[in-house]
């Protein structure tokens, strides 16, 4: 099939006092090969400081996956989710408040 770019969605949730968990989800992409990781100041976090989801079919002939990490509240600007798929790349910021969700479709 042809290449389908992912929809990337970054969310945040309270983890513990002063910390938040940030989760980056990529969905609706094809083929299944994807790079999805958290960067701190543009530098990838060590693998053992991120939690990873498997790349799974989402039922539409496309795939989905996620990656999460914990950060200090107030330091959201330092962190971005980096995505690379089929030769295209993008970076996605952490939304500034709990109620905000960022959805980006990349071509």
């Amino acid at each position: 099939g042809s290449t389908v770019p992912p929809m990337v969605n970054v969310t945040r949730s309270e983890a513990s006092e002063g910390n938040i968990t940030v989760t980056c989800r990529a969905s609706g992409f094809y083929p299944w090969n994807i790079t999805l990781s958290w960067r701190q100041d543009g530098v990838s976090l060590s693998h053992d400081t991120q939690q990873w989801g498997d790349v799974l079919p989402d039922g539409n002939g496309t795939y989905q996956t996620w990656v999460a990490t914990r950060i200090c509240q107030g330091e959201e600007q330092r962190f971005t989710c980096y995505m690379e798929h089929s030769g295209n790349h993008s970076t996605h910021p952490v939304p500034s408040g709990n109620s905000h969700h960022h959805h980006h479709h990349h071509h």
């Epitope: 910390n19 701190q40 100041d41 543009g42 530098v43 990838s44 976090l45 060590s46 053992d48 400081t49 991120q50 990490t69 914990r70 950060i71 200090c72 330091e75 600007q77 330092r78 971005t80 790349h89 993008s90 970076t91 910021p93």
Partner: antibody, heavy 118, light 112 residues
Framework: EIQLQQSGPELVKPGASVKVSCTAS????????IYWVKQSHGKSLEWIGY????????ISNQKFTGRATLTVDKSSSTAYLHLNSLTSEDSAVYYC???????????WGAGTTVTVSS | DILMTQTPLSLPVSLGDQASISCRSS???????????LEWYLQKPGQSPKLLIY???NRFSGVPDRFSGSGSGTDFTLKISRVEAEDLGVYYC?????????FGSGTKVEIK
């Protein structure tokens, strides 16, 4: 080959401003942040700040806030450090640098010497 | 700001000696998620610094295995197992776990 080419030396008067450029080649410019580091003569290194060329977002050392402005021109793969209200304390070598997968300053420019003198 | 204190400031060595440089941070540089952004750089006269070690103990591409990094929390060490002439210069530790990122004051490795 990944390279960061910096602009030439500058001699400027106190109170004036200067714009140092850093042109990247050998990689996709928007994939990696550009960092700026100051080194005064015979002294240690000082981190000024960084810019994400993809989003234009910046994070700076508070010490340089309001004095240093970081910008990029994606069309020419060039990052700029603009310093204003210069004093003799700003006389230094200014480096741009690029991170890699898991490290901060894997590639450095050759440095730009800025001399502030009347 | 996190202060990075390097010792010694000057390290006279004979070629073939082992050299050890200490770097102590004024507070822990282990980030909330466990990441520790501690790096070591070598700067030779008239040159840009060059990366040796990243994330405490990982050697950068092309760096000889006589260089090793270790430590955790606030105490970090760079060791050179057998100093060669090309290793002479000023060594800097650097932390990027917390803003503003800070460098140590440098350790000059020179011939005795």
């Amino acid at each position: 080959e990944i390279q960061l080419q910096q602009s030439g030396p500058e001699l400027v008067k106190p109170g004036a401003s200067v714009k140092v450029s850093c042109t990247a080649s050998g990689y996709a410019f928007t994939k990696y942040n550009i960092y700026w580091v100051k080194q005064s003569h015979g002294k240690s290194l000082e981190w000024i700040g960084y810019i994400d060329p993809y989003t234009g977002g910046t994070i700076s050392n508070q010490k340089f806030t309001g004095r240093a402005t970081l910008t990029v021109d994606k069309s020419s793969s060039t990052a700029y450090l603009h310093l204003n209200s210069l004093t003799s304390e700003d006389s230094a070598v200014y480096y741009c640098a690029r991170p890699g997968s898991y490290w901060y300053f894997g590639v450095w420019g050759a440095g730009t010497t800025v001399t502030v003198s009347s | 700001d996190i202060l990075m204190t390097q010792t010694p400031l000057s390290l006279p060595v004979s070629l073939g000696d082992q050299a050890s440089i200490s770097c102590r941070s004024s507070q822990s540089i282990v980030y909330t998620n466990g990441n520790t952004n501690l790096e070591w750089y070598l700067q030779k006269p008239g040159q840009s610094p060059k990366l040796l070690i990243y994330k405490v103990s990982n050697r950068f591409s092309g760096v000889p295995d006589r260089f090793s990094g270790s430590g955790s929390g606030t105490d970090f060490t760079l060791k050179i197992s057998r100093v060669e002439a090309e290793d002479l210069g000023v060594y800097y530790c650097f932390q990027a776990s917390y803003v503003p990122f800070t460098f140590g004051s440098g350790t000059k490795v020179e011939i005795k």
